[in-house]
Structure formats: structure tokens, C-alpha cells
């Protein structure tokens, strides 16, 4: 009796399973009772990842520099090419088919995690006690002066975007 | 016992044609494909003609292409070889064989076909 | 179609040689290949499948390996039944095609 179903890594194609072709091969022709499968290597600067009966390799993935893209890892001829961001900017979606610059992080907010090339900048706000006065992409929130240490006294409370401001004590007379 | 047994064989002129049989015994023989393999006179092997195990598919050598045909009758137990336009170059012993998982794992013992004016 | 070449085309040796034969396919071909023996005036015979996979019955002095373009057949001890002539067949690509074949002859 012909089969219904095919073993893992076979296919049925007129009553008989043929192997498919293996990770980074092509289909060619399909088995018959007396040959098998024949397939054939991608050609550079293709890639098939799976086990497979296609006539056509993928072609592995461009990196556009005018997109702010580069390599991160060569493609190999079973598996893709995988893209990342120049410096400074990072991927718009998983697939990282288009690159962003860096969010920065307004005054009052600091760098909770410094963007790399696949996420961005994540800031958070500058908690009482911390203060942010300026817009950056790598700053963190700094704490307020201690006035204390430098034995003065507050004369202006800080803010999450300011300073305390600091001076000498009153003498007593 | 698996059996194949050709028959059909003999002297015959160039341009004519033979009818080769190959009776098969001892298995399903519905569930296997066969082929023709044939050895010219001092010569090495050569894969002529296959057929599946319904008749649905057929393959051929591109030398004999065109002019010999494979067939099977399941009821009867036999292959055959139509050989059409024969020529000096067909001279063989042709034997029969089964196929098991793309390789022939019964032979017939050969019938002899010689081709001559 | 693909091409099988073996060699050596003939071969002597003596009775408790190690013998080696080898098939080169003029395309890659995987381990698409089988063995046969044949004696002269009889049918082949399989001895070997899938480029290394012994036909049952076939005794354990023979074996193959190879895949790709390169394969061989070794008879580890020859015995006087193993004087014939081998062939190589590959299926790895329409049609199946054979080697010319390599001739064992008594030393």
C-alpha cells in the first residue's frame, strides 16, 4: 500500500517518501523508486535552515549601512545573517530591519539601562534625594550634595533636576 | 525463495524488435519496483529501465529512450522489456532485478539478446 | 549523469590479503552508494548498501565507507569465493549508474 504519512525528515510526493534536503541544501529532484532526493548546496550568499524540499535557497539578509545597520554575525549557508546598529543607534523592531538614534533622558529623568544595538535607552525618574540637569543618553541620576560633609548648610533644596545649592552656616554672635 | 527468471532472449537484425519477460516468484510482487539492467559482452554493468511497484512510474536510461518500454502485469507475476528499433550496440545479457530500498537485492540469471545482420 | 570511476580496474592478490577498491562519483552524491559482486557467467550480487550497510548473508570480511564523492570497498581477508569482479552503483541522481567495475584476479 502507498503511504499516508512519512517518517521525521521525509516527504510524500507521488505515493512515496522522499528525504528532504538537509540545512543549507537545495531541492534538485525528487526521489523516485530508484534514486534518491538529489539536492545541492546553496549557493553563496544563500541559507536554508530547515530540513526542506525547496527549489530555492534564501537569500541571507543585507545590512544597509544607509539604515545604520551593520553585521553582527556572517550568514553561513544555514543560517541568516544577523544585523545590528552602529553606535548610538538601535534596531527598530526584532528583526532589526532599520536602525533609531538613542533616545536621551530629559533633565529630572536618568539612564536606568544604557541602549545597546538591539534595545534603547531606558530611563527611569530621578527618585527624592537625585537629580538629572542635563539630557543624556548615558548620565544616571546623581545624588544631591551633601551639605553636611562639606560643613554647610542647605540654602536652596534640591530638585530632580537641580542641586541642592550649599552655604556656610550662620554665625552666632 | 525469491525467484526471477527472463525469458524472451535470441538473435535478432538491426532495426527489429524482441519482447523480453522476466516471471517472478517467491514475494509480493505487486509491492516492489523493478528494473532492467543489461552487460554488453566483456563489458560492465548498465541500468537500462525501471518501473514501480504500481506501474505509475517509469524511468529509462537515455540511450534506450523512445525505443523500449517497460511494463508489469501484477496478476501475472511479470515484467517485461519492449525493445523497438534494436541496434548492434544492444547486445547484452539483460537481466531483471528487484528493488528494495534503491538498491537491487534479487537478479534474475540473464537472458542474452544479440543484435546482428 | 553522474559518473562512477573505480580503481583499480584490475587487481591480484592472494588468499588472507587486505583488499581495497574505490569508487569516485564525478558529484557529490551523499552516501547514495552500493556495492555488488559478480562472477563470471552469474548475476550480481549485493553486498553492500547505502555506501556502508551490509546485505544480510553477505559475511563480515566485506565493508564499505566513504560518502560524498569517495567510497570504498574493503575485504579484510580475501577467501577464494571472493576472486570476481565488483561494482560500484550510485542513486544519488537519475539515472542509477555504475562503475566500470575492478576485476579481483588470484596472485
Known amino acids: 500500500e502507498p503511504p499516508t504519512a512519512c517518517r521525521e525528515k521525509q516527504y510524500l510526493i507521488n505515493s512515496q517518501c522522499c528525504s528532504l534536503c538537509q540545512p543549507g541544501q537545495k531541492l534538485v529532484s525528487d526521489c523516485t523508486e530508484f534514486t534518491e532526493t538529489e539536492c545541492l548546496p546553496c549557493d553563496s550568499g544563500e541559507f536554508s535552515a530547515q530540513w526542506n524540499r525547496e527549489i530555492r535557497c534564501h537569500q541571507h539578509k543585507y545590512c544597509d549601512p544607509n539604515l545604520g545597520l551593520r553585521v553582527q554575525q556572517k550568514g553561513t549557508s544555514e543560517t541568516d545573517t544577523i544585523c545590528t546598529c552602529e553606535e548610538g543607534w538601535h534596531c527598530t523592531s526584532e528583526a532589526c530591519e532599520s536602525c533609531v538614534l538613542h533616545r536621551s533622558c530629559s533633565p529630572g529623568f536618568g539612564v536606568k539601562q544604557i541602549a545597546t544595538g538591539v534595545s534603547d535607552t531606558i530611563c527611569e525618574p530621578c527618585p527624592v534625594g537625585f537629580f538629572s540637569n542635563v539630557s543624556s543618553a548615558f548620565e544616571k541620576c546623581h545624588p544631591w550634595t551633601s551639605c553636611e560633609t562639606k560643613d554647610l548648610v542647605v540654602q536652596q533644596a534640591g530638585t530632580n533636576k537641580t542641586d541642592v545649592v550649599c552655604g556656610p552656616q550662620d554665625r552666632l554672635r | 525463495e525469491v525467484q526471477l527468471l527472463e525469458s524472451g532472449g535470441g538473435l535478432v537484425q538491426p532495426g527489429g524488435s524482441l519482447r523480453l519477460s522476466c516471471a517472478a516468484s517467491g514475494f509480493t510482487f505487486s509491492s516492489y519496483a523493478m528494473s532492467w539492467v543489461r552487460q554488453a559482452p566483456g563489458k560492465g554493468l548498465e541500468w537500462v529501465s525501471g518501473i514501480g511497484g504500481s506501474s505509475s512510474y517509469t524511468s529509462y536510461a537515455d540511450s534506450v529512450k523512445g525505443r523500449f518500454t517497460i511494463s508489469r502485469d501484477n496478476s501475472k507475476n511479470t515484467l517485461y522489456l519492449q525493445m523497438n528499433s534494436l541496434r548492434a550496440e544492444d547486445t547484452a545479457v539483460y537481466y531483471c532485478?528487484?528493488?528494495?530500498?534503491?538498491?537491487?537485492?534479487?537478479w534474475g540469471q540473464g537472458t542474452l539478446v544479440t543484435v546482428s545482420s | 549523469d553522474i559518473q562512477m570511476t573505480q580503481s583499480p580496474s584490475s587487481l591480484s592478490a592472494s588468499v588472507g590479503d587486505h583488499v581495497t577498491i574505490t569508487c569516485r562519483a564525478s558529484?557529490?552524491?551523499?552516501?547514495?552508494l552500493n556495492w555488488y559482486q559478480q562472477k563470471p557467467g552469474k548475476a550480481p550480487k549485493l553486498l553492500i548498501y547505502a555506501a556502508s550497510s551490509l546485505q544480510s548473508g553477505v559475511p563480515s570480511r566485506f565493508s564499505g565507507s566513504g560518502s560524498g564523492t569517495d567510497f570504498t570497498l574493503t575485504i579484510s581477508s580475501l577467501q577464494p569465493e571472493d576472486f570476481a569482479t565488483y561494482y560500484c552503483q550510485q542513486y544519488g541522481s537519475a539515472p542509477p549508474t555504475f562503475g566500470q567495475g575492478t576485476k579481483l584476479e588470484i596472485k
Open positions: 532485478a528487484r528493488y528494495y530500498s534503491y538498491h537491487m537485492d534479487y
Open positions: 558529484q557529490s552524491i551523499s552516501s547514495y
